[in-house]
């Protein structure tokens, strides 16, 4: 029950996160004109990954797409790439996780397959979230650098008395949406990976069977099964797969292939 809840919650959190990453990528307000300590302008500038916009106090808004690819700063291209990679990985992760959900039955899919898919989607969500956080952070760093550069020469003298105001840009709403969304996707991914552990059948869980040969004492050997020191035709340690159920004989549990998360 707890596993199903963890998996379901991880899925929902990741879904919200990826929706947020998509929203942030599409938003125009990655950077907005800094209004602090600036003359009151009747024009407000803001920029996104794909276009820049100008909103006039009259209410008229005009947006222009960046129709050049080569003319754009490398950092902006990198941010675009990170966000797109994040969205693609997240989308694939969502698709995989839908089929991995414990509450959804698809044919005769085994729990081990669901565990694998849950782990895969979890890892995808983690990478997706990290891509979004990295993309937003790179952009934020770019803004901070440019902000202080433009502050240094905020007013550029033009012929003595005439001055031109340098437009400075600060963090836009999309950055905060991106950070939160990336964080949610990351958390969702971690939850999926945790859920995967609960879904994974213990492949090396064996019912301990002891065989008694007359006149010999039974020696208890650690290692998940009891071994006999008796003679006879069946002195081999017999391994019986218990299908995931544990007996009180099992003192030591073995790491399964999903335990490295």
């Amino acid at each position: 029950m707890a596993v199903t809840a963890c998996q379901g919650l991880g899925f929902v959190v990741s879904l919200i996160g990826i929706a947020g990453i998509i929203a942030a990528t599409c938003m125009d307000q990655w950077s907005t004109q800094d209004l602090y300590n600036n003359p009151v302008t009747a024009v407000f500038n803001y920029q996104g990954l794909w276009r820049s916009c100008v909103r006039e106090s009259s209410g008229f808004t005009e947006c222009r797409g960046y129709f050049t690819l080569l003319g754009l700063p490398a950092m902006l291209q990198a941010v675009r790439a990170l966000m797109i990679v994040g969205i693609v990985l997240g989308a694939i992760g969502l698709l995989v996780s839908i089929f991995a959900l414990k509450c959804i039955r698809i044919g005769s899919m085994e729990d081990s397959a669901k565990a694998n898919m849950t782990l895969t989607s979890g890892i995808m969500f983690i990478v997706s979230g990290l891509c979004a956080i990295a993309g937003v952070s790179v952009f934020a760093n770019m803004l901070v650098t440019n902000f202080w550069m433009s502050t240094a020469n905020m007013y550029t003298g033009m012929g003595g008395m005439v001055q031109t105001v340098q437009t400075r840009y600060t963090f836009g709403a999309a950055l905060f949406v991106g950070w939160v969304a990336g964080g949610l996707t990351l958390i969702g991914g971690v939850m999926m990976c945790i859920a995967c552990r609960g879904l994974a059948p213990e492949e090396t869980n064996y019912k301990a069977v002891s065989y008694h040969a007359s006149g010999h004492s039974v020696a208890y050997k650690p290692g998940g099964f009891k071994a006999s020191t008796g003679f006879g035709s069946n002195t081999k340690n017999k391994k019986i797969y218990d299908g995931g159920a544990r007996t009180e004989d099992e003192v030591q549990s073995y790491p399964s292939k999903h335990d490295y998360v």
Epitope: V54, S57, S58
Partner: antibody
Framework: EVQLVESGGGLVKPGGSLRLSCAAS????????VSWVRQAPGKGLEWVSS????????YYADSVKGRFTISRDNAKNSLYLQMNSLRAEDTAVYYC???????????WGQGTSVTVSS | DIVMTQSPSSLSVSPGERVTISCKSS????????????LAWYQQKPGQPPKLLIY???TRESGVPDRFSGSGSGTDFTLTISSLQAEDVAVYYC?????????FGAGTKLELK
């Protein structure tokens, strides 16, 4: 057809108050920024105040700040200018205008005359 | 506040002649976001409210004859009437539309010679 009709002007004593109104029609008033501009007799144009659409930010000329208040009623398609502590230098024709592309004032009313005199 | 300096203050021109009116602002009216200059030109005939001619320094308002044109960038702007008509006799104002307060120039009175 866009129409802006001012009213409320008249003769008032110094220190007195007056409320100008502007009835707008022919365009989506709630989506438009609107302004008041005045012109003293035989003088040039002087921007007085603006109010934006949406959150309704207000802006004032230094000469009227603290004395004049611009407001709007989108339900009535009306713009107002509450003028307090009037001075002789406030005597002018007051125009109601619509701000559009480039923040330019593309439509103007015929104006209402305000005279401040003892 | 932004100071708008118009010149000349008055002008007497013969019909058919080319007219140029200058307007200088104390700060640049160029917005880096869209590379547009926030300056407007108005025409006011006696007894009438002003009429918008040009916005964004060079964009002609609809219905304005093409003999009117605006040019300039940053701080220096010009209104040109390519061939003066009798009905163009008026006072012309430039206005800063970039910074509040939205200041006007003192005006240029255009008369027929």
């Amino acid at each position: 057809e866009v129409q802006l009709v001012e009213s409320g002007g008249g003769l008032v004593k110094p220190g007195g108050s007056l409320r100008l109104s502007c009835a707008a029609s022919g365009f989506t008033f709630s989506n438009s920024a609107v302004s008041w501009v005045r012109q003293a007799p035989g003088k040039g144009l002087e921007w007085v105040s603006s109010i934006t659409s949406g959150v309704s930010y207000t802006y004032y000329a230094d000469s009227v700040k603290g004395r004049f208040t611009i407001s709007r009623d989108n339900a009535k398609n009306s713009l107002y200018l509450q003028m307090n502590s009037l001075r002789a230098e406030d005597t002018a024709v007051y125009y109601c205008t619509r701000q559009f592309k480039g923040n330019a004032l593309d439509y103007w009313g015929q104006g209402t005359s305000v005279t401040v005199s003892s | 506040d932004i100071v708008m300096t118009q010149s000349p203050s008055s002008l007497s021109v013969s019909p058919g002649e080319r007219v140029t009116i200058s307007c200088k602002s104390s700060q640049s009216l160029l917005n880096s976001g869209n590379q547009k200059n926030y300056l407007a030109w108005y025409q006011q005939k006696p007894g009438q409210p002003p009429k918008l001619l040009i916005y964004w320094a060079s964009t002609r308002e609809s219905g304005v004859p093409d003999r009117f044109s605006g040019s300039g960038s940053g701080t220096d702007f010009t209104l040109t009437i390519s061939s003066l008509q009798a009905e163009d006799v008026a006072v012309y104002y430039c206005q800063n539309d970039y910074f509040y307060p939205l200041t006007f120039g003192a005006g240029t009175k255009l008369e027929l010679k």
